[in-house]
């Protein structure tokens, strides 16, 4: 299996009750606006074929996509949560900037691409869905990276 390096976050990042609560509140707010409950972005298909040691790298890719293609374009929505949560997630992304995989990561890119394609295909409702799954993103980052 490919070796991942620098793919670690300090657990203190996930032990801040205020920002954790705000992240979950943002996800809840967005999920209320999400009418497409049949489609899931972060779930078993995303992790399929990805070993536990590769998952932080996988979630880094998902985090970066979510920030750049979803949260930044939608930054005026779901206030006041968005203005607090986006900088928090951006800091996590920055801390994972040196997280890389040595070796073939095609299987990871394939899974991430499916998530990206789903969001793009759904358009704005895909972006809303991605925001509604920020609780899953948060939990997946925590479980994979600490």
């Amino acid at each position: 299996a490919p070796i991942s390096s620098h793919c670690r976050l300090d657990k203190s990042n996930f032990q801040q009750p205020y920002i954790t609560n705000r992240t979950f509140m943002l996800a809840k707010e967005a999920s209320l606006a999400d009418n497409n409950t049949d489609v899931r972005l972060i779930g078993e298909k995303l992790f399929h074929g990805v070993s536990m040691s590769e998952r932080c790298y996988l979630m880094k890719q998902v985090l970066n996509f979510t920030l750049e293609e979803v949260l930044f374009p939608q930054s005026d929505r779901f206030q006041p949560y968005m203005q607090e949560v986006v900088p928090f997630l951006a800091r996590l992304s920055n801390r994972l900037s040196t997280c890389h995989i040595e070796g073939d990561d095609l299987h990871i890119q394939r899974n991430v691409q499916k998530l990206k394609d789903t969001v793009k295909k759904l358009g704005e409702s895909g972006e809303i869905k991605a925001i509604g799954e920020l609780d899953l993103l948060f939990m997946s980052l925590r479980n994979a990276c600490i």
Epitope: F24, T37, R40, G43, S140
Partner: antibody
């Protein structure tokens, strides 16, 4: 075939400890979290926590924090759950179950281990 | 006391449809999973992510969710379906798995 095989039934006195094992086979042990869930007639199912077989990292339910210990042995693909200072109300069937994400569903369960606490 | 509310029991005649509900607060952004537990046996996953069916589970089993209620539907009920059925979600704020109290399905 994916299997989780647990150790046999235990009878313990109050104050004693118990260690239940869960041997996994038929899949890559390190790729799924192993959760422990207990079932009692009074309380129904109670989630106790999980162990990440890849790192040995754990997450415990608030009720069991500082009490339960979950470990794993990669060499024999076995997860363990230890409960010290048993009380009468710890009488339950203890299950291990596997989960891909750490926060989702359990697609395979062990057969269960009945732990009876009685003086 | 369970945070997820299920009817304790229900009876259904063979060939009919059984509908088991699971209610809870803020279900909107939670994923609901269902397990079947026959007497003396371990639970078996029958529905995950609200409505997905694992391989090996008959098509007669289906799941849905509307608002704060999730529903497990068993069509053309058979005698072998008699069991306890439990719903489960992950509560992200508590960071724990939560289970319903279970519904005992009796096939008449």
């Amino acid at each position: 075939e994916v299997q989780l095989v647990q150790s046999g039934a235990e009878v313990k006195k109050p104050g004693a400890s118990v260690k239940v094992s869960c041997q996994a086979s038929g899949y890559t042990f390190s790729d799924y979290y192993i959760h422990w869930v207990r079932q009692t007639p009074g309380q129904g199912f109670e989630w106790m926590g999980w162990v990440n077989p890849d790192t040995g990292g754990t997450r415990y339910a608030q009720k069991f924090q500082g009490w339960v210990t979950m470990t794993r042995d990669m060499s024999n693909t076995t997860a363990y759950m230890e409960l010290p200072r048993l009380r009468d109300d710890d009488t339950a069937v203890y299950y291990c179950a596997r989960d891909l994400t750490g926060y989702d569903y359990y697609d395979r369960w062990g057969q269960g281990t009945l732990v009876t606490v009685s003086s | 006391q369970s945070v997820l509310t299920q009817p304790p029991s229900m009876s259904v005649a063979p060939g009919k449809t059984a509908t088991i509900t699971c209610g809870g607060n803020n279900f909107r952004n939670k994923r609901v999973h269902w397990y079947q537990q026959r007497p003396g046996q371990a639970p078996v996953l029958v529905i995950y992510y609200d409505s997905d069916r694992p391989s090996g589970i008959p098509e007669r089993f289906s799941g849905s969710r509307s608002g704060n209620t999730a529903t497990l539907t068993i069509s053309r009920v058979e005698a072998g379906d008699e069991a306890d059925f439990y719903c489960q979600v992950w509560d992200f704020l508590a960071d724990e798995a939560m289970f319903g109290g279970g519904t005992k399905l009796t096939v008449l």
